[in-house]
């Protein structure tokens, strides 16, 4: 056997070129015959009345064809011969590839709630061979599965992805990629995550700043909630007591004037959205004012005690538990 | 009506060869894949091969793989499956089917003996 | 690797649920077809991609899918269920086909 040709692939739409090729030559007749067994080329003529063949070299030791502007039902075996005696033949089998037509994401709900789990599609049309489909959540790479399906040739592939969402999911684009052999680059579509959640409830002291509360001072909170949608209401209640009647609400803010023994208790920042409720608890212990000492008369050591106030907070903002902002007395 | 019907099955020796033919009708034949699957006595499926529509693609399990060759005529709307070098293992009913993974219509299959 | 495992043999009382497993390395990338086989018959597929059913499959089947294992389930099982069951996919490599071992079904 001293005829031989090469596998070609070609992406649809380009160029294939088939080569017979003879080693030895004794210039005996080469033709190329197409998987139908018509004739493309024999030798130098060509009786096929398709002129997207073109003859690219002919000679004792080769002839080398170009097809055009491949499709799909050129693909196939194509057989080469070579007239000596006995005759031989070889086969070149032309494979076309086709990139998906189309890459379509679709979310089953454009807007999630925390801990939700959402079904996230993506299909790429009618491709050859099946496309492989790749799936990030931002930088991670994630686990979808796969149907598909056929037709003349040509693949449909849905791949499927189960998604448990967070509030940090939230604004993070989920990536369908695609891995083909007829695709250079990076092919992929996204959408972007959009993730609602109950509020986050944190309480702020901005008075007095180092955080010791005397008798006759003044105490003011601040409570900052966050959540998606933003929580509209933002309350204030005094755990098992009424609120002081000195005491002032304004939005987020409460403000305490001339704190006293009475005002003692557990103070709650409430905030609410269409997700589910949170709160944080504030626990106010009011010490004893600084005592004042008269100047000395006669030569006295004084020793001082400083007592340091160290605010421990513990949230919790899982709706309808408990939480609590304590400040500790060391 | 979908109908896959096989044919060419029987009794072959150790070394022998085998053409066996599926006649499809009821669906456009060259727009699927078709398949060979195999069911050896009392024991599970096993999926021997499978063609493109146009024929231009063929897979083979490694178990066959240069020993069988799977073809079709869609001029003819029928699959065929050539076996060469069979085994006494290579014993079984051979179904043909349509798809080549979600086979959605099977042949009622042809039984293949390979025996001294 | 490129198997399918399935246990040999499961049984049912009648008019209660089952499920018939398959695992595999394949399923954590395809979705599983499900296959009835009753003695002398070709095999007819009951259950394909996430969960669908071609025309004519009963309702009382069903399936689903989890990480590399794939389940099928019939939820009041018949007498006329009584049969070997098949689990298929596309191996990993996506050109090749597997099956699972079969599972034999009896209803009790």
């Known amino acids: 056997q001293n005829l031989f040709t090469k596998d070609v692939t070609v992406i649809e739409g380009e160029v294939a070129t088939i080569s017979c090729q003879v080693n030895k030559s004794d210039d005996s007749v080469i033709q190329l015959l197409n998987p139908n067994r018509q004739t493309i080329y024999f030798r130098d003529f060509r009786p096929l009345k398709d002129s997207r063949f073109q003859l690219l070299n002919f000679s004792s030791s080769e002839l080398k064809v170009s097809l055009t502007n491949v499709s799909i039902s050129d693909e196939g075996r194509y057989f080469c011969q070579l007239y000596t005696d006995p005759p031989q033949e070889s086969y070149t089998t032309i494979t076309v590839l086709v990139p998906p037509r189309n890459l379509m994401i679709d979310i089953q709900r454009d807007t999630a709630v925390e801990g939700e789990e959402i079904e996230v599609n993506c299909t790429a049309m009618a491709s050859k061979p099946a496309t492989t489909i790749r799936w990030f959540k931002g930088n991670t790479e994630l686990k979808g599965k796969s149907e598909v399906e056929e037709w003349s040739d040509m693949y449909t592939v849905t791949s499927q992805l189960m998604l448990k969402v967070h509030k940090e999911d939230d604004g993070v684009p989920v990536i369908c990629q695609v891995e083909h052999p007829a695709v250079t680059g990076n092919l992929q579509t996204q959408r972007y995550l959009e993730v609602q959640y109950k509020p986050q409830v944190h309480i702020q002291m901005t008075y007095p700043l180092q955080g010791l509360t005397r008798e006759g001072d003044a105490l003011e909170l601040t409570c900052e909630a966050i959540g998606k949608p933003q929580p509209v209401m933002v309350t204030w209640v005094r755990v098992d007591d009424e609120m002081p009647q000195h005491a002032v609400l304004s939005g987020p803010n409460l403000f305490i004037n001339n704190l006293n023994k009475t005002d003692n208790g557990t103070y709650r920042c409430e905030a609410s959205n269409i997700v589910g409720k949170a709160h944080s608890d504030y626990m106010l212990y009011v010490y004893d004012p600084p005592t004042t000492i008269p100047p000395p008369t006669t030569t006295t050591t004084t020793t001082t005690t400083t007592t340091t106030t160290i605010l421990t907070i513990i949230t919790d903002s899982r709706a309808g538990e408990e939480g609590s902002i304590r400040a500790v007395d060391h | 009506e979908v109908q896959l019907v096989e044919s060419g099955g029987g009794l072959v020796q150790p070394g022998g060869s085998l053409r066996l033919s599926c006649a499809a009708s009821g669906f456009t034949f060259s727009s699927y894949a078709m398949s060979w699957v195999r069911q050896a006595p009392g024991k599970g499926l096993e999926w021997v091969s499978a063609i493109s529509g146009s024929g231009g693609s063929t897979y083979y399990a490694d178990s066959v793989k240069g020993r069988f060759t799977i073809s079709r005529d869609n001029s003819k709307n029928t699959l065929y499956l050539q076996m060469n070098s069979l085994r006494a293992k290579d014993t079984a009913v051979y179904y043909c089917a349509k798809t080549n993974w979600n086979f959605d219509y099977w042949g009622q299959g042809t039984l293949v003996t390979v025996s001294r | 690797s490129s198997e399918l495992t399935q246990d040999p043999a499961v049984s049912v009382a009648l008019g209660q649920t089952v499920r018939i497993t398959c695992q595999g390395d394949?399923?954590?990338?395809?979705?599983a077809s499900w296959y009835q086989q009753k003695p002398g018959q070709a095999p007819v597929l009951v259950i394909y991609?996430?969960?669908n059913r071609p025309s004519g499959i009963p309702d009382r089947f069903s399936g689903s899918s989890s990480g590399n294992t794939a389940s099928l389930t019939i939820t009041g099982a018949q007498a006329e269920d009584e049969a070997d069951y098949y689990c298929?996919?596309?191996?990993?490599?996506?050109?090749?086909?597997?099956f699972g071992g079969g599972t034999k079904l009896t209803v009790l």
């Open positions: 394949s399923l954590r990338s395809y979705y």
């Open positions: 298929n996919s596309r191996d990993s490599s996506g050109n090749h086909v597997v």
């Open positions: 991609g996430k969960n």
